[in-house]
């Protein structure tokens, strides 16, 4: 049967516009004589289906709403509002172009109080910086504003003669943006020599150079060994940006670790990411299934090591730190990282890196017949010959006669699709001339040597080690407060670079976040804008797991810790894909604020609280203490104020100032005061009948907070249980007559235990059906048989438990709701099977790590130190992020878990070691 005798219909429209739909067509069959005689029914397929619109659906970038305007910063007279990227754009969706932070000028309601450093016995520069007294009048501009060299009778020179600074010394003092992989503004002032005449000699010049105070040591050298060209082969970019032994990971005081691509390092500690170059490489790899070969060579001019402490900060950085407010302000604090980077250089080299990344078609490389090692070798040989012009380069037969080279007049490099320049250092025009162009005739002989020569005058910092910029915030006013705020800001800031916000990429591509756009880094054998295309030999269906974003930090628990978690669900591993690497839960020590509601205190490095008291005025002119508004008080309270002095009006807790909050003392002894009042921002604890208990019991409740009313045992609330603070009143309104009524559960119980009723002089179990039709409070209950939890009325639960339903376990009072209480309830049920103590307590049963409270008949967890040693239920565990093993008893395990601390049970019994 010739099937095409019966033509196909048109393809139907695609079932989806994106994300892989299907379409079908069918044969237009006429059951004629030919059809029957030639067995066409059996031979011809009647319908065909194919995949269509396989490209991923575009995800448009989505910005959140702006938060409120920050307080007006009285020092810069600006305020800001911030919004975050709720969802980055992906798969060609619309980008976000609007700013995330907006500033506007404003009229401050507070005075600008930049804390000044207390120079004690040091010299104070006009800029406010403190320097050693010995630096006055030494003929050197140690202050930076020359104020230490004013009014000098005689100057005593530090050095016997004048020395030049080390060339490009300022580069070593720049900040480095770890997440963007580039240097930023100057953080260390490397022109400051600290009154010490320390010099260093270079073999290239006869005059020694002066060593700045910030540098521990400097060593000049020039490395241009001809054979130190290194080559790397990458099947795809996932390994380039994810190289396990060279991953750039920075863990900010318990913050998330962010891996960033490293483009050159001869030290494993270096972290470098050329964002634009990596993006270029990703986009190139989308065009076709690609492999990459990278060739690189390092030239060093000098090595340097920065001092470990007492570093002299640049004026611009110091000013930026001094202008930071004590109150945490996300926009102002994260701006430090934009301007100055996230890290500073602790050691490194100045020099240049010749570094090119060649993109080859995987198909063409495979067909060339060369192994990976051979392709690397050919790239190295040809670079030596055509770029470095090394005279004694022996070109090997294999490199010129393979299928790829033969297509391009014996050149292997000309077979590349494109190259991406990662060259650093040297004059830009020479660096640009070294970049390889497809089809170009090759380089002139002196191009490389010109660039190499220019590296000496125009070096870059290469091969470096970093430390967080936060560590530099020392010996400035309020250093501890500002360090803590900067740490918090770094965690917020770094989260913006975390690809956890991206949707999973097709074909196991790895998402990477570039600004507000997610890009897909394709696995070997896949290509397309979003890695949605497969080459014929790509057969894998595995999906590697990727982390979702971290939850916010929990509050601090009784063991000085707070924690956060993330899930391996973006996507979860499927079909044999790799599990997520790294920790699911992070724990860190808490930093505590000493003053809870009085704004951020200024804590200095010596950890002393600084309280600035205005001196008492003994003159009798001025103004007496003014009368504050209702529910307000005067901040800087004293008997008499001098003319021109301001007083600040503050409001009691639960109220906030509306209007201009400063009064000024006038020459006639009166106060100039605008309209200011203290308006309530919270609800007052409601007045209820004494029998009712309010939980949580506070004086004031913030808007959105709720309370619950409860009654003594045997009674229930005769009305709603839950009330919420809205505006400055309770919803629903709380009636004065609200009271407790007798609980029918208790009436039935008589003198019997819970779940039983009196029948004559006997106690028998209640019937869940007959005796529990009345209202009783909700409990959250776990059924070990069905391995499920559910909400049950207390009466029904107790009756069923009495009827010996041992599989029912009390989790907590109230209906089941996801959260820590439910989590813990389930976990304690699991632990309870090994408990040596089972003590009945109200609805509950208390275990080894708990105590039954007499007053409330509830099980309360012991704190770990309250556990008694020993018992035969021992476990070998790992605690927190520690790697060491520890033997704990069941009480300690239960108490630690109840406190929400991480403890991993390795095996029952003592640890073996």
């Amino acid at each position: 049967c010739f099937c095409d005798h019966y033509p196909w219909s048109q393809w139907s429209s695609c079932s989806k516009t994106c994300n892989s739909g299907t379409q079908s067509r069918h044969r237009q069959i006429v059951v004629d004589k030919y059809y029957q005689e030639n067995f066409c029914e059996q031979i011809c397929s009647k319908q065909e289906t194919r995949e269509c619109n396989w490209q991923s659906c575009p995800i448009n970038c989505l910005l959140g709403d702006f938060g409120p305007w920050s307080d007006c910063d009285p020092c810069v007279e600006k305020q800001s509002k911030v919004r975050s990227v709720l969802r980055p754009s992906q798969f060609g969706g619309q980008p976000c172009t609007e700013p995330l932070v907006v500033f506007q000028p404003c009229i401050p309601s507070k005075l600008c109080k930049i804390e000044e450093a207390d120079c004690k016995n040091k010299f104070r520069c006009d800029s406010g910086r403190c320097i050693a007294r010995k630096l006055e009048c030494n003929g050197e501009n140690d202050c930076g504003d020359n104020s230490d060299e004013r009014d000098c009778g005689r100057t005593k020179a530090v050095c016997a003669r004048k020395y030049n600074p080390i060339p490009s010394v300022q580069l070593m003092g720049n900040g480095f943006h770890f997440l963007a992989g580039e240097p930023r503004g100057e953080v260390l002032d490397n022109s400051f020599t600290g009154g010490i005449c320390k010099t260093v000699k270079s073999s290239r010049t006869s005059n020694p150079y002066r060593v700045p105070a910030n540098l521990e040591n400097v060593g000049f050298e020039v490395e241009t060994a001809e054979d130190d060209l290194k080559t790397d082969f990458y099947k795809d970019l996932t390994s380039l940006g994810h190289n396990e032994n060279q991953q750039g990971s920075f863990s900010s005081q318990g913050g998330s670790s962010f891996r960033v691509p490293i483009f050159y390092s001869s030290k494993r500690s270096e972290n470098v990411n050329h964002n634009s170059a990596f993006k270029q490489a990703i986009q190139a790899s989308h065009k076709k299934d690609s492999s990459f070969i990278r060739i690189h060579k390092v030239m060093k001019v000098l090595n340097f090591t920065t001092k470990a402490k007492d570093l002299y900060l640049s004026d611009v950085f110091l000013k930026a730190l001094n202008h930071l407010p004590l109150e945490y302000n996300s926009a102002l604090y994260t701006r430090i990282f934009d301007d100055f980077g996230t890290h500073y250089f602790t050691s490194g080299s100045l020099g240049g890196v010749y570094d090119l990344l060649y993109q080859f078609s995987s198909e063409e490389l495979k067909n060339s017949g060369l192994t990976e090692e051979e392709t690397k070798h050919c790239v190295r040989i040809e670079t030596k010959k055509r770029v470095l012009f090394v005279k004694k380069t022996k070109v090997e037969h294999r490199c010129t006669t393979n299928k790829l080279s033969e297509k391009h007049e014996g050149s292997f490099l000309q077979g590349a699709e494109k190259s991406i320049s990662l060259i650093r250092g040297g004059r830009s025009e020479y660096a640009a001339a070294l970049a390889w162009e497809k089809g170009s005739s090759g380089l002139e002989e002196k191009t490389f040597s010109d660039w190499l020569e220019s590296v000496k005058e125009n070096p870059a910092v290469i091969d470096f080690e970093l430390a967080p910029i936060v560590d530099l915030v020392r010996n400035i006013p309020c250093a501890v407060t500002k360090r803590n705020n900067l740490r918090k800001a770094f965690q917020e800031y770094a989260a913006k670079f975390d690809p956890c916000q991206c949707a999973p990429c097709p074909n196991n591509g790895r998402p990477t976040l570039s600004g507000t756009e997610c890009l897909c880094v394709c696995q070997s054998g896949t290509y397309g804008e979003n890695c949605e295309r497969r080459s014929p030999d790509y057969k894998s269906n595995a999906v590697d797991g990727h982390w979702g974003c971290w939850s916010s930090w929990s509050t601090c628990d009784a063991t000085y810790k707070r924690s956060r978690t993330r899930e391996c669900s973006n996507p979860a591993p499927k079909r044999g894909g790799k599990r997520c690497e790294g920790e699911k839960r992070q724990e860190e020590d808490c930093t505590f604020s000493i003053m809870e509601n009085n704004g951020q205190p200024c804590i200095n490095d010596d950890e002393e609280m600084k309280e600035v008291n205005l001196p008492e005025i003994e003159a009798d002119s001025g103004c007496p203490q003014p009368v504050p508004p209702e529910n307000g008080f005067i901040r800087n309270e004293k008997k008499l104020y001098s003319v021109g002095e301001d007083v600040e009006i503050s409001c009691l807790t639960g109220f906030e100032t509306v209007g201009y909050q400063y009064f000024r003392c006038l020459p006639d002894g009166t106060w100039r005061q605008g309209d200011v009042e203290c308006q309530r921002t919270e609800c007052i604890k409601p007045v209820v009948q004494e029998i009712l208990t309010i939980t949580p019991f506070q004086r004031l409740y913030r808007i959105g907070e709720s309370i619950e009313l409860t009654c003594p045992k045997g009674f229930v609330v005769a009305g709603p249980l839950r009330y919420t603070c809205q505006g400055n009143s309770w919803t629903p309104p709380i009636s004065n007559s609200l009271t407790c009524e007798k609980d029918s559960l208790t009436k039935l119980k008589g003198h019997c235990q819970l779940g039983q009723k009196q029948s004559g002089s006997e106690c028998i179990c209640m019937s869940p059906e007959e005796d529990c039709s009345h209202y009783s409070e909700d409990l959250c209950v776990f059924d070990t048989d069905s391995n499920d939890y559910f909400t049950s009325p207390a009466c029904k639960f107790l009756a069923e438990k009495c009827l010996n339903n041992q599989q029912l376990h009390f989790l907590h009072i109230g209906s089941c709701q996801d959260g820590r209480q439910l989590e813990w309830g389930l976990e304690r049920t699991r632990l309870s099977s090994n408990s040596t103590k089972k003590e009945s307590c109200g609805y509950d049963t208390c275990y080894d790590w708990e105590k039954c409270t007499a007053s409330t008949s509830k099980c309360a967890c012991l704190l770990p130190p309250q556990c008694f040693k020993g018992g035969n239920q021992l476990y070998c565990v790992k605690m927190g992020s520690s790697t060491s093993e520890k033997t704990l008893n069941i009480c300690e395990v239960g108490a630690i878990r109840c406190a929400n601390r991480k403890v991993e049970i390795l095996h029952p019994g003592k640890c073996l070691a």
Partner: antibody, heavy 118, light 112 residues
Framework: EVQLVESDGGLVQPGGSLKLSCVAS????????MAWVRQGPTKGLEWVAT????????YYRESVKGRFTISRDNAKRTLYLQMDSLRSEDTATYYC???????????WGHGTLVTVSS | DVVLTQTPSTLSATIGQSVSISCRSS???????????LYWYLQRPGQSPQLLIY???DLGSGVPNRFSGSGSGTDFTLKISGVEAEDLGIYYC?????????FGAGTNLELK
């Protein structure tokens, strides 16, 4: 009956060192965590440090970390507090304390006075 | 650190009178599994502190039941129903819900 007896404190100069000890009786010493709590003339009661049964885990308040060391000798039924780099703000009566299932600081010694002054 | 504010700082009472002491916390002491680690201690003149109340409202061993504790969240109260001569001294509240453990500044109960 649970008894906790602290050694005599004394007068120490700022920057100096002192080691306090606390002998326990009336209970199985090695079965309990132990702690030091102090009561200063201005600061009131302050928890200082805690140690677990065998001394493998220790916990300190931030202001004494790196200067004070809590340790124990279960054979001698004795708890120690080694205090180095003493400051005037460390002046206080130091109590040795044992927990129970009711509270972290259920039993207290009689206390010993440490004065840091030049 | 969590700050515990006790009021009043001094309390004068006559024998047999009922009195209350308040302890207010700078943040809620109710943890996420429903436990509140708030304790009351009495320090008689020249003696060490002695546990009176644990977990807000439970009576310590051997403590007479004229002492009672109540409260939740951030507001807590110790009540003595009928003061006796042996009750004189300084009363401290203490929290262990958040690290580091902290004590209130104390309330001195004296005879009128």
């Amino acid at each position: 009956e649970v008894q906790l007896v602290e050694s005599d404190g004394g007068l120490v100069q700022p920057g100096g060192s002192l080691k306090l000890s606390c002998v326990a009786s009336g209970f199985s010493f090695s079965d309990y965590y132990m702690a030091w709590v102090r009561q200063g003339p201005t600061k009131g009661l302050e928890w200082v440090a805690t140690i677990n049964y065998d001394g493998s885990s220790t916990y300190y308040r931030e202001s004494v970390k790196g200067r004070f060391t809590i340790s124990r000798d279960n054979a001698k039924r004795t708890l120690y507090l080694q205090m180095d780099s003493l400051r005037s703000e460390d002046t206080a009566t130091y109590y040795c304390s044992r927990p129970s299932t009711e509270a972290l600081f259920a039993y207290w010694g009689h206390g010993t006075l440490v004065t840091v002054s030049s | 650190d969590v700050v515990l504010t006790q009021t009043p700082s001094t309390l004068s009472a006559t024998i047999g009178q009922s009195v209350s002491i308040s302890c207010r916390s700078s943040q809620s002491l109710l943890n996420d599994v429903g436990n509140t680690y708030l304790y009351w201690y009495l320090q008689r003149p020249g003696q060490s502190p002695q546990l009176l109340i644990y977990l807000v409202s439970d009576l310590g061993s051997g403590v007479p039941n004229r002492f009672s504790g109540s409260g939740s969240g951030t507001d807590f109260t110790l009540k003595i129903s009928g003061v006796e001569a042996e009750d004189l001294g300084i009363y401290y509240c203490m929290q262990a819900s958040h690290a580091p453990y902290t004590f209130g500044a104390g309330t001195n109960l004296e005879l009128k």
